[in-house]
Interface confidence: low
């Protein structure tokens, strides 16, 4: 802190505000009878330079003039933009123990003269708004700079406002607080911005405009939509606008879209009919306004109106599939499945499905409605049956989709050939096949059906399926496909009245199983040993098991074990082996193999055959 300058004064030549690159002389003078008490020649004046309150330089070597013990002049150069503080101190040279005493100080500001303001832009928001102008000030001056905005117009209209820029605030916009009215629509107005600081002044070029050039209408408000006769595709959009508006722009989109539908409307008077809306779809609507067909500016977009269009009756065809299971000699269970319509087809909330099972010749008909996407009935095994399903919302029902109920795997000649299942990535499996070799009738379509091979999956979970055109021989299945799970995949070839199928197992990713099968029993029958086991628990299989291996070796032997490899079948849980010596104790165990490798061994069992040697 600098005390009031009792000891002396500090002055700056040419001025305390200088242009960038200029030098300045700073003089420090002691007042009469001030200084070191012993004798004046011991007075030494020093000048210290501070930037941001940090001492950066002692200017002792920059003395250009010295009246010993009375005054000193220092030249300062290369000052940076902004404020620099200089403090003059008195050092009594014969008293080293006392610190220098502050005499006085001065602040020098370095800056530049203002550039002419450019790019003036004026707007009046709404017919009742006020004129506000903004501009580009150019380079920062580093000095307090005053800006004056002047407007002149017809009938000796003049108006001005001022603001300033410094290191805390920027002045590049002013509101004149006056309103231009539509009756001045053809009149011309001129604005000019003048900038002034301690190093100079400058003026912008005059900027000329008319009422239409600068008035931006207020965005439309009170937006609403009326759907004609509760139509889901036609509606009248209504809004409020300022009185002078002649042109509107409408934009609207479903909320899940990223591109707007754009419409221009001339003299709409706050109303416009839309005819291409999607039923039962959440839309966002916005409107902008303009006061003149060719000139002027568009308003900002209005607040969004978000609303859902009404329902209309469903369109599209349901994707139906079925399963047949014989219950006894004269009855079968038919389970129908179908996929939900997508939103553009459902066109509303599906309330229920109408399901019909009909025996073609005897005209027996079973009908029901359900809210689920499956339906099961027991029907006679005789006769030709057809099923149909339609979806209903509050406005009506879709056209029924028909499917003939045939024996899906009943015709060997229709079975697709060379079915393969190849892992594509973690989430899907590529299934390929060749067409049936000697089909009696033309294949109308292929159905690829898949289901996880886990206990109870047939009863607990509906199947997943894809319909494939008859000229395609591959399908990429991904719905509900998880890694490390084995799926049973069936490819059905369907003709008008017959079906043939081929089955394969596949997985999207596999690892070696976590454990081997558990041997539950070893029994001896007619000189053969039967090994029985329990399958590996489903979560531990980690993909499709290709085969099991049964290993055996004599107890306490160090020789390599013998092994027998068995093709995996879900239904099989025992296998005979016949190459063991009688009255020799063997150790037996099992492993399981996937495409990724072999599991660790399962439990070990000892057994000593009693029968004759082979």
């Amino acid at each position: 802190n600098i005390d009031v300058c009792k000891l002396g004064t500090v002055t700056v030549q040419p001025a305390p505000v200088i242009p960038l690159g200029s030098a300045a002389n700073i003089s420090c003078s002691l007042n009469p009878k001030q200084g070191c008490s012993h004798y004046p020649s011991s007075n030494e004046l020093i000048l210290l330079k501070f930037v941001n309150d940090v001492l950066v330089e002692n200017l002792h070597g920059k003395k250009v003039h010295d009246h010993t013990g009375h005054s000193s002049t220092f030249q300062v150069t290369n000052l940076s933009l902004g404020m620099t503080l200089f403090v003059c101190k008195l050092n009594c040279s014969n008293s080293q123990k006392k610190p220098p005493v502050p005499v006085c100080g001065v602040e020098i500001s370095v800056g530049v003269a203002p550039e002419p303001p450019q790019n003036i832009s004026c707007v009046q928001e709404g017919e009742n708004g006020t004129v506000a102008c903004s501009w580009n000030s150019g380079k920062v001056t580093y000095l307090k700079t005053n800006y004056t905005l002047q407007l002149s117009g017809p009938n000796n209209l003049t108006c001005q406002k001022q603001c300033f820029s410094d290191n805390r605030q920027n002045c590049n916009r002013l509101d004149l607080g006056i309103n231009l009215s539509p009756d001045l629509a053809e009149s011309r107005f001129i604005v000019r911005v003048t900038a002034i600081n301690d190093l100079g002044n400058s003026s912008s070029l005059p900027h000329t405009f008319t009422f239409l050039d600068i008035v931006i209408p207020l965005p439309p408000w009170d937006i609403r939509i009326n759907f004609l006769n509760a139509s889901g595709s036609r509606g009248t959009l209504q809004w409020e606008d300022e009185g002078q508006v002649v042109l509107n722009q409408l934009r609207y989109q479903p909320l899940n879209s990223t591109s707007w539908n754009m419409v221009n409307a001339t003299n709409a008077k706050g109303k416009y009919d839309l005819r291409d809306l999607r039923p039962f779809t959440e839309y966002e609507f916005q409107i902008s306004s303009k006061l003149h067909l060719s000139g002027g500016s568009w308003s900002n977009w209005s607040e969004s109106l978000r609303t859902r269009t009404p329902e209309e009756e469903p369109v599209g065809i349901l994707d139906i599939w079925y399963m047949k299971q014989d219950i006894d000699y004269d009855r079968q269970q038919i389970s129908l499945f179908w996929k939900s319509l997508n939103p553009s087809e459902a066109r509303g909330k599906i309330l229920h499905y109408q399901v019909t099972l009909q025996e073609v010749t005897k005209k027996t008909t079973l009908q029901n409605t359900t809210r689920h996407t499956s339906w099961t009935r027991v029907i006679p095994r005789t006769g030709a049956w057809t099923a149909s399903v339609s979806a209903a919302n509050s406005k009506g029902a879709s056209a029924p989709t028909h499917i003939n109920i045939v024996d899906l795997c009943g015709t060997g000649l229709l079975a697709p050939h060379q079915v393969s299942a190849k892992s594509e990535n973690m989430d899907n499996i590529l299934v390929t096949w060749q067409p049936p070799k000697k089909a009696d009738s033309a294949v109308r379509e292929y159905i690829v059906e898949w289901r996880a091979l886990q206990p109870g999956s047939i009863t607990k979970f509906p199947p997943h399926w894809l319909r494939i055109p008859p000229d395609n021989m591959s399908a990429l299945i991904s719905e509900n496909i998880k890694p490390y799970i084995c799926y049973e995949i069936r490819v059905h070839a369907l003709s008008e009245s017959q079906g043939g199928c081929s089955s394969i197992r596949g997985d999207s990713k596999h690892k070696a199983p976590v454990s081997g099968p558990h041997i539950t029993a070893i029994t001896e029958k007619k000189e053969r040993l039967f090994i029985s086991w329990t399958h590996i628990p489903f979560p531990e299989q980690r993909g499709c098991i290709l085969h099991y291996r049964i290993y055996w070796k004599e107890r306490d032997s160090t020789a390599q074990p013998e092994l027998c490899e068995i093709q995996y079948r879900r239904s099989q849980n025992s296998h005979p082996i016949s190459s063991l010596q009688p009255r020799v104790t063997y150790v037996l165990w099992m492993t399981a193999v996937t495409a990724a490798g072999e599991s660790p061994q399962g439990n070990e069992r000892e057994f000593c055959p009693q029968g004759k040697a082979n």
Partner: nanobody
Framework: QVQLQESGGGLVQPGGSLRLSCAAS????????MAWFRQAPGKEREFVAV????????YYADSVKGRFTISRDDAKNTVYLQMDSLKPEDTAVYYC??????????????????WGQGTQVTVSS
Amino acid sequence: QVQLQESGGGLVQPGGSLRLSCAASRRTFSKHAMAWFRQAPGKEREFVAVVRWSGIITYYADSVKGRFTISRDDAKNTVYLQMDSLKPEDTAVYYCAAGDYRGNGYYVPGMYDYWGQGTQVTVSS
């Protein structure tokens, strides 16, 4: 089943900032619309913001526009709510929600299939 877990709530002074996070348990995260709702005592659950399609589309309630920013990191299965210039009226329990993206009524709580337990945000001096 998708589990959602919010974090980041707390007490903050008016004008302050908080960042809420919501971690989802499943890889199908990117197929969902992820939203934040809030519920003040005695009031209905109110929509705050939603982010869809890996962050390409966002919507905000008018009361938070310009102050709150919603974003998502599909690699981390996480959605964030950056709350700046907080006001006392922002005090509420903030819930994270996820729903299959069908484009209908993103501001309606009933459109969302999965919800977190909520995290308390209190704005008070």
